[in-house]
């Protein structure tokens, strides 16, 4: 199980002194700087128990493996569910603490209930402040059951849950119907995935027999030991005031673990520290009791005395949980409670024993989980002990589990179980990811998902040109860093593979799948320059450029023109996909805009140096169209046009332009300027008789505006052929602008 403890300080006289601390004993826990070590998270979980919003809680990190939550301002801030998450990958674990208000109407007799699959769980809510109304039980925030207030038994409301299954796990609450939810009794029910004493898929494996109140984990068969105990079977007591899987942590403050609730990974739940009991963990154990919540009884024999933290303290000549074993009986010494090896390795395991008579090589044996017995290949005999060495055959996954070292002499026998974890070297499930590429280097992210077991100690990146038979180049990198492959050939495909390793002999995994990464083209080096440009309309610009002459083929696929509109903060990019092109027409520009213009050569995805920029001002767009244009024939050669000025003018009109065209004619139209912008009529002269004409107009301010509607009119008959139309405005002759 993950070495993760959530501590709640229950000295509740002042909520501002209340704190929660999450402590991880995992290697590298809480670093959070890379994908291999996510941070410890400690938070209030408001999904089930919602409390009124208050000021945000303060989270303080103390080193890499501890995080503390403070800033509780009122007692209601404390009520509810808190969780700490730690461990990496598949070992990521959530530890949960449920806090009850000491002033609630209903109080739990016991907050955490850990039961086996198929058991009957009984949750008991003690009446603290009576109300004569229904009691509603909820499970994970949803309605579960109702009890009449008359149904209390000895001042307690009981919820019986027969034949519980793992989905029944969760937060239960008992609340008087018309009371505040904060006055509820909150419980945590943990249902192991197996029946008593069993673990594993199908619950076929036997638990190691956890001591001192340890709980067998239904997934891995490990004992989750109560705070203050350690060892594969929780057989060893820590020194007073210490906790953690290796007793490595110390309770804060001068009164040791008094007033602290300890929450551990499921299926353990929460309890007081060793030697303490009571709803606030402030009461010392009664004589003859010891351990977490004082749940254990000493029953010491042969003159042993009961210590409330560790149990029986035996006089010399005796050992065992109850001082029931004589020291003449052989004893396994200093056996590690857990060993880790990599798959398919052939490790050596040592087992030391002492006793009277003295154990010899043949009296010590090693038993594997499948019952196979290994005999030692050699033994080292010292004055105080014999150490037997066992050569283990090539390990397979089925060797994971509890091994046993057993010593037998005429004085008796002793055995010690220890956990062997056979770890699978990591194998990448995916190819490495290309982050960026240049012509001579590739930047690669080697962090990929993997099968097998972590932690990852090293990452090797193997690479060589595609279709090459040359040796692979290898680079060893830190797991958390991106890798730059240097000195590569441009425009070349490289096959790249990742190999991961975990600690220990034989920890190198197989190579991951290959991926093809291609270096970029050579960068284009030529810098174009802008030859010129001219405006072809209020929104059109023709640009031309040149390139320096250099020997050899041109390295480039085309040109990129960039127009920067500084006023609006917008960039327009125009791709010219021929490297031979030296001119381009840019359309759809914004009239009246000041643009900065440059051009650069591109090759593949790489851009060459930009030309020196040019600054171009497009003329503004013209005014709206004149309104209500009307044509009226005056004679066989004259037509009068009348109109109304455009609306919403952006400035004074400088002139009008009339377009004249013979209806159905194929020739170009004629443009005639009306240079008196105040006028609203004009006469077009010199037209042909009996001819149908089309007219339209537009105004000009700084640029020409929109055309008006087109009107048709025919000249009167019997006239002579005219030289061409001219215009008169209020009897003033004007020139022709074609």
């Amino acid at each position: 199980a993950v070495d993760l403890t959530l501590l709640a300080n229950l000295r509740l006289t002042d909520p501002q002194r209340f704190f929660l601390t999450c402590v991880s004993g995992e290697a590298g826990a809480g670093r959070g700087s890379d994908a291999w070590g996510p941070p410890l998270l400690l938070e209030k979980d408001d999904r089930i128990v919602r409390t009124p919003p208050g000021p945000p809680l303060r989270l303080a990190r103390n080193g890499s493996h501890q995080v503390t939550l403070r800033g509780f301002s009122k007692p209601s801030d404390l009520v509810g569910v808190f969780s700490c998450v730690g461990g990496a990958g598949a070992r990521r674990t959530r530890v949960i603490y449920v806090h009850n208000s000491p002033g609630a109407h209903l109080l739990p007799d016991k907050v955490t209930h850990t039961v086996n699959k198929g058991d009957t769980a009984v949750l008991s809510a003690r009446v603290h402040k009576e109300k004569q109304t229904d009691v509603i039980w909820k499970s994970n925030g949803s309605y579960f059951y109702t009890l009449d207030w008359h149904e209390a038994q000895d001042g307690r409301f009981l919820l019986q849950l027969p034949n519980v299954q793992p989905p029944s796990s969760g937060i239960y609450s008992a609340t008087y119907l018309e009371a505040s939810p904060l006055g509820s009794a909150f419980f945590r029910l943990i249902v192991r995935g197996c029946g008593a004493g069993r673990w594993g898929p199908g619950c076929t494996k036997e638990c190691p027999g956890c001591l001192h109140g340890g709980v067998c984990h239904d997934h891995d068969g490990e004992c989750v030991c109560p705070p203050g105990f350690t060892g594969t079977r929780c057989e060893q007591a820590c020194r007073e005031g210490r906790f953690g899987q290796s007793c490595q942590e110390q309770c804060p403050g001068i009164s040791g673990c008094r007033g602290l609730t300890f929450c551990l990974p499921d299926p353990y739940g929460c309890s007081c520290g060793s030697g303490w009991r009571g709803s606030q963990c402030q009461e010392a154990c009664a004589p003859g009791h010891f351990g977490a919540d004082c749940r254990l009884q000493c029953q010491c024999q042969n003159g042993g005395t009961c210590d409330r933290f560790s149990g029986c303290v035996c006089p010399s000549g005796w050992h065992g949980v109850h001082c029931e074993k004589s020291d003449r009986i052989p004893q396994i010494l200093n056996m590690a409670s857990e060993l880790e090896f990599n798959l398919e390795t052939m490790p050596r395991i040592n087992c030391a024993a002492a006793g009277n008579p003295f154990p010899v090589r043949g009296s010590i044996e090693l038993r594997k989980p499948d019952g196979t017995v290994l005999l030692s290949t050699k033994a080292i005999v010292e004055p105080e002990k014999t150490t037997a060495e066992f050569e283990v055959p090539r390990l397979v996954l089925a060797d994971s589990g509890f091994w046993e070292c057993r010593v037998s002499t005429s004085g008796g026998q002793d055995s010690r179980r220890f956990k062997v974890n056979v770890k699978v070297p990591p194998v990448p499930l995916a190819a490495p990811r290309l982050l960026t590429k240049q012509s001579r280097q590739l930047v690669v992210s080697p962090l990929v998902s993997f099968s097998g077991d972590g932690p990852i100690s090293t990452v090797r990146l193997h690479y060589r040109p595609q279709d090459s038979t040359m040796d692979w180049s290898t680079i060893v990198v830190d797991p958390s860093e991106n890798v730059t492959l240097m000195n590569l050939r441009p425009k070349t495909g490289y096959s790249v593979r990742v190999q991961l390793s975990r600690p220990g002999e034989g920890g190198e995994g197989a190579w991951g799948p290959p991926t093809l990464m291609t270096t970029d083209c050579p960068e284009p080096l030529l810098q174009p320059w802008l030859e010129g440009w001219h405006v072809e309309g209020t929104d059109r610009l023709r640009v031309s450029w040149s390139l320096p002459l250099v020997p050899g083929p041109l390295v480039g696929d085309g040109f990129l023109l960039r127009l920067w509109d500084g006023t609006r903060g917008q960039e327009r990019r125009e791709n010219v996909s021929s490297p031979q092109a030296r001119t381009a027409l840019l359309t759809g520009l914004t009239p009246g805009t000041h643009y900065q213009l440059d051009v650069q050569l591109y090759h593949c995805t790489l851009l060459g140096p930009a030309s020196p920029p040019a600054h171009v001002l497009l003329p503004p767009s013209g005014p709206p169209a004149p309104r209500h244009l009307h044509a009226q024939a005056l004679s066989d050669s004259e037509i009068q046009l009348t109109w109304k000025h455009p609306e919403a003018l952006p400035g004074p009109i400088s002139k009008y332009v009339v377009e004249v065209q013979v209806a159905g004619g194929a020739g170009d139209p004629l443009w005639i300027d009306v240079d008196r912008p105040e006028e609203t009529s004009t006469i077009i002269r010199g037209l042909n008789a009996s001819t149908r004409y089309l007219f339209r107009m537009r105004a000009s301010i700084q640029g020409l505006g929109d055309w008006s509607n087109t009107v048709e009119e025919s000249t009167l008959g019997n006239g002579l052929q005219a030289e061409g139309p001219v215009q008169e405005s209020r009897a003033a002759e004007e020139g022709l602008d074609q």
Partner: antibody
Framework: EVQLLESGGGLVQPGGSLRLSCAAS????????MNWVRQAPGKGLEWVSR????????VYADSVKGRFTISRDNSKNTLYLQMNSLRAEDTAVYYC??????????WGRGTLVTVSS | DIQMTQSPATLSLSPGDRAILSCRAS??????LAWYQQKPGQAPRLLIY???HRATGIPPRFSGSGSGTDFTLTISSLEPEDFAVYFC???????FGGGTKVEIK
């Protein structure tokens, strides 16, 4: 689908008896309090009786106290109302209703009881 | 006993109108009040509980407010299917109000 289905209604003479049943499905019947609510023709709703999930506690409206008995069989997911000494004013559609916090969140379609000579 | 009084007895409105229904308790009932809708020939349906919480599946045009003795059910914009009888109920002794009929004008 959560469902309640009443049965057992009919025509009965004053002073007679009738037993209504309500079959529950689609939820864990044994965990919920159950109620009978009635509605006289063209009138409003009147709560009649409630039974707690265990069956150990019951409560009645004053108008039916001593004449009606509510019961349940959790193994059969069924609620009952035994009605004795029936009166003309007991004529109504009788609904069975589930409650979780003394509000009726699931109702049956009702069964008509007519008390007439 | 706490008595529940609903007003008006009948409310004549058109689709799209806003409907405001009132329920008064004879004593303080905090927010322990529910509203139900009943259409002809059908069982009642829970709309609002604890004075202001919409029951599952109830559209947002239905809203409840009030606390103590005065409570209101508001239908923001009447749909054709909303024309029905509405009852309030206090949960202490399961007493219902006399009902308000919302009919088409």
């Amino acid at each position: 689908e959560v469902q309640l289905l009443e049965s057992g209604g009919g025509l009965v003479q004053p002073g007679g008896s009738l037993r209504l049943s309500c079959a529950a499905s689609g939820f864990t019947f044994s965990r919920y309090p159950m109620n009978w609510v009635r509605q006289a023709p063209g009138k409003g709703l009147e709560w009649v009786s409630r039974i707690w999930p265990s069956g150990g506690s019951t409560v009645y409206a004053d108008s039916v106290k001593g004449r009606f008995t509510i019961s349940r069989d959790n193994s059969k997911n069924t609620l009952y109302l035994q009605m004795n000494s029936l009166r003309a004013e007991d004529t109504a559609v009788y609904y069975c209703a589930r409650d979780s916090s003394r509000y009726f969140d699931v109702w049956g379609r009702g069964t008509l009881v007519t008390v007439s000579s | 006993d706490i008595q529940m009084t609903q007003s008006p007895a009948t409310l004549s409105l058109s689709p799209g109108d806003r409907a405001i229904l009132s329920c008064r308790a004879s004593h303080n009932i905090d927010n322990f009040l529910a509203w139900y809708q009943q259409k002809p020939g059908q069982a009642p349906r829970l709309l609002i509980y604890d004075a202001s919480h919409r029951a599952t599946g109830i559209p947002p045009r239905f809203s409840g407010s009030g606390s103590g003795t005065d409570f209101t059910l508001t239908i923001s914009s009447l749909e054709p299917e909303d024309f029905a009888v509405y009852f309030c109920q206090q949960r202490t002794n399961w007493l219902f109000g006399g009902g308000t009929k919302v009919e088409i004008k």
